[in-house]
Amino acid sequence: QPNNSLMLQTSKENHALASSSLCMDEKQITQNYSKVLAEVNTSWPVKMATNAVLCCPPIALRNLIIITWEIILRGQPSCTKAYKKETNETKETNCTDERITWVSRPDQNSDLQIRTVAITHDGYYRCIMVTPDGNFHRGYHLQVLVTPEVTLFQNRNRTAVCKAVAGKPAAHISWIPEGDCATKQEYWSNGTVTVKSTCHWEVHNVSTVTCHVSHLTGNKSLYIELLPVPGAKKSAK
């Protein structure tokens, strides 16, 4: 067991390799192109280390001439993956990430998959489908979510520190009960943020404090019993 005055509790969510997808069911595919896309661009938060499947507009593949995936990642040249139906050929330009691939053969499935999403996959993904009736687009602003590691410890008399380390986006920290708090944020080069909240409780009937960390990947609460004030021996409550 750790010493109460040192780090008391830590938590790091463990995720089995889950898959997330915004793709439509085949039954939803429609020939009515004018009603296909209610929303051309979608913001899509995806947890790191999961698998993601991105879809083209729901257009029957038999109506297709060319499918192009355009991938714009931060600090990298634009990557394109194209499939030309007539010649059954695929072509890639400036694509170096082997985790971003077609789900299967593009003549059978136009979807794109990202295996084991990483922070570097933050970016914009767009499928362009060229058909005899015109071009149809679907874009994704992919936001990679990173679960912060949460720690709670005491460092001084009736003072506790709660940290949400390397989360993306930044976590929000609140306390029960409210104390006299100062919060700092530290930004890392990989896009993650560490939030540190330091609180002091002067009120002596506060026994245990709870740090509540809110994050898009889920919420976490930790609690710790405050140490007595040095020299304090006996009090009635």
Epitope: N4, E225, P228, K233
Partner: antibody, heavy 114, light 107 residues
Framework: QVQLVQSGAEVKKPGASVKVSCKAS????????MHWVRQAPGQGLEWIGN????????NYDEKFQGRVTMTVDTSTSTAYMELSSLRSEDTAVYYC???????WGRGTLVTVSS | DVQMTQSPSSLSVSVGDRVTMTCQAS??????LHWFQQKPGKAPKLLIS???NLEDGVPSRFSGSRYGTAFTLTISSLQDEDIATYFC?????????FGQGTKLEIK
């Protein structure tokens, strides 16, 4: 795995004192508050007080102030709760608990009867 | 002192029922709490720590949640062995205070 082993049942006369012990293992005894609560037959639970073994700091509920004494022996990782001037309404099961109330002893039945 | 109001005080139930009980702190004071199960002659058993964390070995039919300053313990599908008294303990303020308990009885 934290374990709290309490002393055996006691029968006391009104006006007497009782001292219940609670021996802890499986955690750093001096780093966690030890609390004492009691439960009268068929009743709810009530908090008596707590002691921090690392410093001897104590909080008592006002209801028990003047009648209760909590002590620790850090060499044996044992906490003690002594209640004096016993009356029949002190008949209850007394529990020690630690780790912010997540680890409990099995309880000690104290019967006060003339 | 923070008073914990627990409701209902008793509940007549059948196997398979979904059972819910609530604890609320006086004056809507923000607190944290644990949920316990107690059977006659036994020490309380911790089910849920810190309002919503299921303890190791506790069946997943038990769950705890917080709605503002109200706390709920839910048994999704009651089993025979769940017949007991349940109570909450607030551990944010001294003195620690307990709910009066919810006693489950078979119909």
């Amino acid at each position: 795995q934290v374990q709290l082993v309490q002393s055996g049942a006691e029968v006391k006369k009104p006006g007497a004192s009782v001292k219940v012990s609670c021996k802890a293992s499986g955690h750093t005894f001096t780093s966690y508050w030890m609390h004492w609560v009691r439960q009268a037959p068929g009743q709810g639970l009530e908090w008596i007080g707590n002691i921090y073994p690392g410093s001897g700091s104590i909080n008592y509920d006002e209801k028990f102030q003047g009648r209760v004494t909590m002590t620790v022996d850090t060499s044996t990782s044992t906490a003690y709760m002594e209640l004096s001037s016993l009356r029949s309404e002190d008949t209850a099961v007394y529990y020690c608990l630690t780790m912010t109330g997540t680890s409990w002893g099995r309880g000690t039945l104290v019967t006060v009867s003339s | 002192d923070v008073q914990m109001t627990q409701s209902p005080s008793s509940l007549s139930v059948s196997v398979g029922d979904r059972v819910t009980m609530t604890c609320q702190a006086s004056q809507g004071t923000p607190i944290n709490l644990h949920w316990f199960q107690q059977k006659p002659g036994k020490a309380p058993k911790l089910l849920i720590s810190g309002a919503s964390n299921l303890e190791d070995g506790v069946p997943s039919r038990f769950s705890g949640s917080r709605y503002g300053t109200a706390f709920t313990l839910t048994i999704s599908s009651l089993q025979d062995e769940d017949i007991a008294t349940y109570f909450c303990l607030q551990f944010t303020y001294i003195p620690w205070t307990f709910g009066q308990g919810t006693k489950l009885e078979i119909k």
